[in-house]
């Protein structure tokens, strides 16, 4: 029994769960999901026993082995693989166990303004970038770009200080997790702060 | 200094099969997004395709899906190109890409390596 | 796909001229555009991404503008050394494209 492999997949992309058997005279070999049964193999009889009919066409054995291959990957496969190895020269089955962790392609993210004041030409607010879905570990980086200025902010929340008179600057968020990145339609200082321009001190949303 | 270099090129029948290597150095080749791209000769630049950090995605022009594995190994600092049926306009020097700060522009480029393929 | 068409194909100029070329992309890409410097014999240098923001080291003649379907980089005073071919290229969706290239030569 080897430590726990994590495996990262894409949903409706495929993932194979490697295993190397040394054991030499194998009578059965068993792939649990979540502790229920998935597949079952006797090399014997050649005989590959899929527990659910929904994961018949999902499940493959490449190359002859026994290192399983799962394909149409959904999000709720994320979860705890184990497979145990079986032969009456064991006195124990020969086990390794698994985390899958399926994760969604990334749509483009979305910016919504906070409060926005304007004071002495300043104007001053935040710009929160979010995943219209939520998706889970999404990590989230902003690039403000101009002539000024070409630097990265870490996090969802940019906050944004711009002086009227200043060069015109563009924010672009862009959100990674394991398996995509995408990023935000570029959005402009000058744009945003337009709305707050005729009072100078407007607080708007 | 980092510094992609790539091998395996050489000339190959049409019909052929040819793996391209790039060995990285000098950063954390297993934090990047990798690319490959190619040029044939006097001609423009064509992207082939990326493949994330940990190998769960890999993304491919359409028009070379079905001919051209992307893989790499992150234990190794290597990017692999295997090209399967390769014809005449198959021709061409295959860079490996870096893209900068792991966005979508490349910073970083092999010196490339040249694939001819000739009877 | 995106299709970026390049114009004009080749640019022949003298050293000290303003040198302008153009990147149109057959659909809107946002500010997703970079464009590529590529020597004779050489690899390609990023020179500029985000459609206007020059990489570090690049010389300040160096410039790009535009945004959605028309793109530009322009150099704004030739120099020997910026003879080389240029591509631009999109980001914006999959696949990757890059525009055929306008070389830039020196009368």
């Known amino acids: 029994s080897g430590p726990v492999k994590e495996l990262v997949g894409s949903v409706g992309g495929a993932v194979t769960f490697p295993l190397k058997s040394k054991v030499k005279q194998v009578d059965s070999i068993v792939w649990t999901f979540n502790t229920t049964p998935l597949v079952t193999i006797q090399p014997e009889g050649g005989t590959i026993i899929v527990t659910q009919n929904r994961n018949r066409e999902r499940v493959d054995f490449p190359d002859g082995g026994y290192s399983l291959k799962l394909s149409k990957l959904k999000k709720n496969d994320s979860g705890i693989y184990y497979v145990g190895i079986y032969s009456s020269s064991l006195q124990q089955p020969s086990t390794q166990e698994y985390v899958l962790h399926v994760y969604e392609h990334l749509s483009k993210p979305k910016v919504t303004m906070g409060l926005q004041s304007n004071k002495n030409g300043t104007c001053v607010t935040n710009l929160t970038c979010c995943m219209e879905h939520g998706e889970e570990d999404v990590i989230y980086t902003w690039k403000a770009l101009g002539q000024a200025a070409n630097e990265s902010h870490n996090g969802s929340i940019l906050p944004i200080s711009w002086r009227w008179g200043e060069s015109d600057m563009t924010f672009i968020c862009v959100a990674r997790n394991p398996v995509s990145r995408n990023f935000s339609s570029p959005i402009l200082a000058r744009k945003l702060c337009e709305g707050a321009a005729d009072d100078p001190d407007s607080s708007m949303v | 200094e980092v510094q992609l270099v790539e091998s395996g090129g050489g000339l190959v029948q049409p019909g052929g099969s040819l793996r391209l290597s790039c060995a990285a150095s000098?950063?954390?080749?297993?934090?990047?997004?990798m690319s490959w791209v190619r040029q044939a000769p006097g001609k423009g630049l064509e992207w082939i395709g990326e493949?994330?950090?940990?190998?769960?995605?890999?993304n491919y022009a359409p028009s070379l899906k079905d001919k051209f594995i992307i893989s790499r190994d992150n234990a190794k600092n290597s990017l692999y190109l295997q090209m399967n049926s390769l014809r005449a306009e198959d021709t061409a020097v295959y860079y490996c890409?870096?893209?900068?700060?792991?966005?979508?522009?490349?910073?970083?480029w092999g010196q490339g390596t040249l694939v001819t393929v000739s009877s | 796909q995106i299709v970026l068409s390049q114009s004009p194909a080749i640019l022949s100029a003298s050293v000290g001229d303003r040198v302008t070329i153009t990147c149109k992309a057959s659909?809107?890409?946002?500010?997703?555009v970079a464009w590529y410097q590529q020597k004779p014999g050489k690899v390609p240098k990023l020179l500029i991404y985000?459609?206007?923001t020059r990489h570090t080291g690049v010389p300040d003649r160096f410039s790009g503008s535009g945004s959605g379907t028309d793109f530009t980089l322009t150099i704004s005073s030739l120099q020997p050394e910026d003879v080389a071919t240029y591509y631009c290229?999109?980001?914006?969706?999959?696949?990757?494209?890059f525009g055929q290239g306008t070389k830039v030569e020196i009368k």
């Open positions: 493949i994330n950090p940990d190998s769960s995605t890999i």
């Open positions: 000098g950063f954390d080749f297993s934090r990047y997004w």
């Open positions: 290229q999109q980001y914006s969706s999959y696949p990757y494209t």
């Open positions: 890409a870096r893209p900068d700060g792991n966005y979508w522009y490349f910073d970083v």
């Open positions: 985000w459609a206007s």
């Open positions: 659909q809107d890409v946002g500010i997703a």
